[in-house]
Amino acid sequence: AVNGTSQFTCFYNSRANISCVWSQDGALQDTSCQVHAWPDRRRWNQTCELLPVSQASWACNLILGAPDSQKLTTVDIVTLRVLCREGVRWRVMAIQDFKPFENLRLMAPISLQVVHVETHRCNISWEISQASHYFERHLEFEARTLSPGHTWEEAPLLTLKQKQEWICLETLTPDTQYEFQVRVKPLQGEFTTWSPWSQPLAFRTKPAALGKDT
């Protein structure tokens, strides 16, 4: 099982969670495996049980503390190991020295709400969740709007190159149902990636006023 292609990828949410995915071709589905975290300058260790997410991949979340507590800094290195039970002992399958602030993936933005809606425009706001104060304003956002008859993949991406937790959508069609999503990414970190997309926010533009040329 060890000789198949193996990948062990983890991301830090910038506060108190490291999420890991381990994939291993030819690994036994019913094998009991876990991720163990051993920081280089902290007194705590943490373990999570890997649970199957597909035929050959497993995932788990290392919960390091209260959701908004700052458990790691830019100087921390956490040795992460995948351990799988083989008979009476645990065997190390994968290992890495994890630099949390080089491998960031924030939580999806939350609390999306329509601030103001008109016939052709809609102002939407949101909040970021469990994001470190270390970033200050060094965040960027991507947003997309789902129009009738289209898919999310077809929706053009709107980029906000600063920490701006609102957007004014223009050139919308009156009396039309839309959905909106946003995601966030810190500017810091060589392997940092976008957060998951937020839950979609559904809204409807106002109908055009009768007798008015819109």
């Epitope: 000789n3 040795t79 190991r81 994968a94 890495q96």
Partner: nanobody, 126 residues
């Protein structure tokens, strides 16, 4: 299964040098990293040095940095530990170890390794 055989141990004066070698055989295709550990009487086995499959990454315990050098000869399935400026505290049984674990760390521990040699004694006289 991987078989490991150490050689090169012996008696050396303090300040002297010694070169340990480890020959690997068997399922060597599964080896990702190899390392050296040592165990003095009454003490726990401790990490000394490790090297990646390609030889591009190495790690050492602080107490041997600048004195010991680990190297790898993949064509001969050998790993070497060149030990210079030996001290009395370097006296121990030295074990070669191999792991199939994918990836790399600078903080190896004994349980990371699944194949072990029988060990070779290094004695440092003053």
């Amino acid at each position: 299964q991987v078989q490991l055989v150490e050689s090169g141990g012996g008696l050396v004066q303090a300040g002297g040098s010694l070169r340990l070698s480890c020959a690997a055989s068997g399922s060597i295709f599964s080896i990702n990293a190899m390392g050296w550990f040592r165990q003095a009487p009454g003490k726990e086995r401790e990490f000394v040095a490790a090297i990646s499959r390609s030889g591009g990454s190495t790690a050492y315990v602080d107490s041997v940095k600048g004195r010991f050098t680990i190297s790898r000869d993949n064509s001969k399935n050998m790993v070497h530990l060149q030990m210079n400026s030996l001290k009395s505290e370097d006296e121990a049984v030295y074990y070669c170890a191999a792991t199939a674990a994918v990836g790399w760390t600078s903080r190896w521990i004994t349980t990371d390794f699944d194949s072990w040699g029988q060990g070779t004694q290094v004695t440092v006289s003053s």
